[in-house]
Interface confidence: low
């Protein structure tokens, strides 16, 4: 029996379309592919971030496979290729590896990056993203923002810079259609006469920076003697009621506090007849069924009743 | 409305096979993922394998990895989960589900808060 071989896949690269940090990876089929005929290749792809732990696997009848990478670092990657058992008439056969990788030539110190880059999705409509200058940079050194998701054609620069003393510190970015749900790339790069700027480069996802308007509309309703039932509703937006985790803070005569985090937009809480004051404040926060994290929103207005016994009344705002 | 229907599960001895079938109507995209997930009694509900319909890439969980192939019928609407050399601890309700909006599947551990649309399941047993 003369053993079965397979070459690996030929031209294997890793191309930098200029999405900053969603890449191309591609390769053309193995040389002496003629006793395969009927058989269809496959290829055992992994790759991986220069000083991850893992690989990703990905198996593959395609010439091509794209995702998403962290440019701040190096990318490595390698190939092989598989004829499946029934081509062999026995077991799967494997090609060596082919192995190749990519990274980006780092310009400037480290510390020239921008510095605490915060992003925030407000209300799932406006997203806003800030930073602070490198660390020793000279207040001619001005940094540019760009982003690109899947569904544009191009990477795009901001057009609203935030501005401090001159210096561009953050962005205010324009409807973003269709853009939550995958990953939102963004570089910050920089340019100044005197050194060269380190750029940055960031990935995340909308849904999961989002930071909701706080909720609205809080009232009381009297349920029972000693039960009463707290509501607020939805702010308004795109967010659907499915999305919203709550924080409540309710404090009774000025002592007691009492905290909670519900589903939906109503707490019923027990009372005694003795209570003469009650407040309480709301938050909202995007839940974990339309997101994987999240920012409270800031609180609602107080809500209070007081003056009259609570058991005799239904309160309204 | 996005509808999925599951089909191809019963009872098997371990290290039999079965394939498993998804087929899914009702949408517009070209560009959506379709994943395979199961839940074991008593269990939560797990990310197995998931199909990109724009790059015809697979993403496996490790138990499963060389076990489980997902391949995409001739209609592009129907998803196969041909799972092989299968063992008891394979018992479970498998669900396809679908997400229209997005394009490559995401990491298996995270694949659950990702897909908008689901089927009913269909119970796979491994049993002697």
């Known amino acids: 029996d003369t053993e079965i071989k397979v070459n690996p896949p030929q031209d294997f690269e890793i191309v930098d379309p200029g999405y900053l940090g969603y890449l191309y990876l591609q390769w053309q089929p193995p040389l002496s592919l003629d006793h395969f005929k009927e058989c269809t290749v496959e290829y055992e792809l992994k790759y991986r971030n220069i000083g991850s732990e893992t690989w990703k696997t990905i198996i593959t009848k395609n010439l091509h496979y794209k995702d998403g990478f962290d440019l701040n670092k190096g990318i490595e990657a390698k190939i092989h290729t598989l004829l499946p058992w029934q081509c062999t008439n026995g077991s799967e056969v494997q090609s060596s590896w082919a192995e190749t990788t990519y990274w980006i030539s780092p310009q400037g110190i480290p510390e020239t990056k921008v510095q605490d880059m915060d992003c925030v999705y407000y209300n799932w409509q406006y997203l806003l993203c800030s930073w602070k200058p490198g660390i020793g940079v000279l207040l001619d050194t001005n940094y540019n923002l760009f982003y690109w998701y899947e569904g544009l054609d191009h990477a795009l620069q901001c057009v609203d810079y935030i501005k401090a003393d001159g210096q561009n510190i953050g962005c205010r970015f324009p409807y973003l259609e269709a853009s939550d749900y995958k990953d939102f790339y963004i570089c910050v790069n920089g340019s100044s006469e005197n050194k060269p700027i380190r750029s940055s480069y960031f990935t995340f996802q909308l849904q999961n920076i989002v930071k909701p308007l706080p909720p609205v509309y809080l009232t009381f309703t009297r349920e029972s003697s000693c039960e009463i039932k707290l509501k607020w509703s939805i702010p308004l937006g795109p967010i659907p009621a499915r999305c919203f985790d709550y924080e409540i803070e309710i404090r009774e005569d000025d002592t007691t506090l009492v905290t909670a985090t519900v589903e939906n937009e109503t707490y019923t809480l027990k009372t005694t007849n003795e209570t003469r004051q009650l407040c309480f404040v709301v938050r909202s926060k995007v839940n974990i069924y339309c997101s994987d994290d999240g920012i409270w929103s800031e609180w609602s207005d107080k809500q209070c009743w007081e003056g009259e016994d609570l058991s005799k009344k239904t309160l309204l705002r | 409305e996005v509808q999925l229907v599951e089909s191809g599960g019963g009872l098997v001895q371990p290290g039999g096979s079965l394939r498993l079938s998804c087929e899914a109507s009702?949408?517009?995209?070209?560009?959506?993922?379709i994943g395979w997930f199961r839940q074991a009694p008593g269990k939560e509900r797990e990310g197995v394998s998931c199909?990109?319909?724009?790059?015809?890439?697979?993403v496996y969980t490790d138990s499963v990895k060389g076990r489980f192939r997902l391949s995409r019928g001739t209609a592009k609407n129907t998803v196969y989960l041909q799972m092989s050399a299968l063992k008891p601890e394979d018992t479970a309700v498998y669900y396809c589900?679908?997400?229209?909006?997005?394009?490559?599947?995401?990491?298996?551990?995270?694949?659950?808060?990702?897909?908008?649309?689901w089927g009913q399941g269909t119970l796979v047993t491994v049993s002697s």
């Open positions: 589900a679908m997400d229209s909006r997005r394009v490559t599947c995401p990491e298996i551990s995270t694949m659950h808060r990702n897909f908008d649309s």
């Open positions: 009702g949408f517009a995209s070209d560009d959506y993922i």
């Open positions: 199909i990109s319909s724009k790059y015809a890439n697979t």
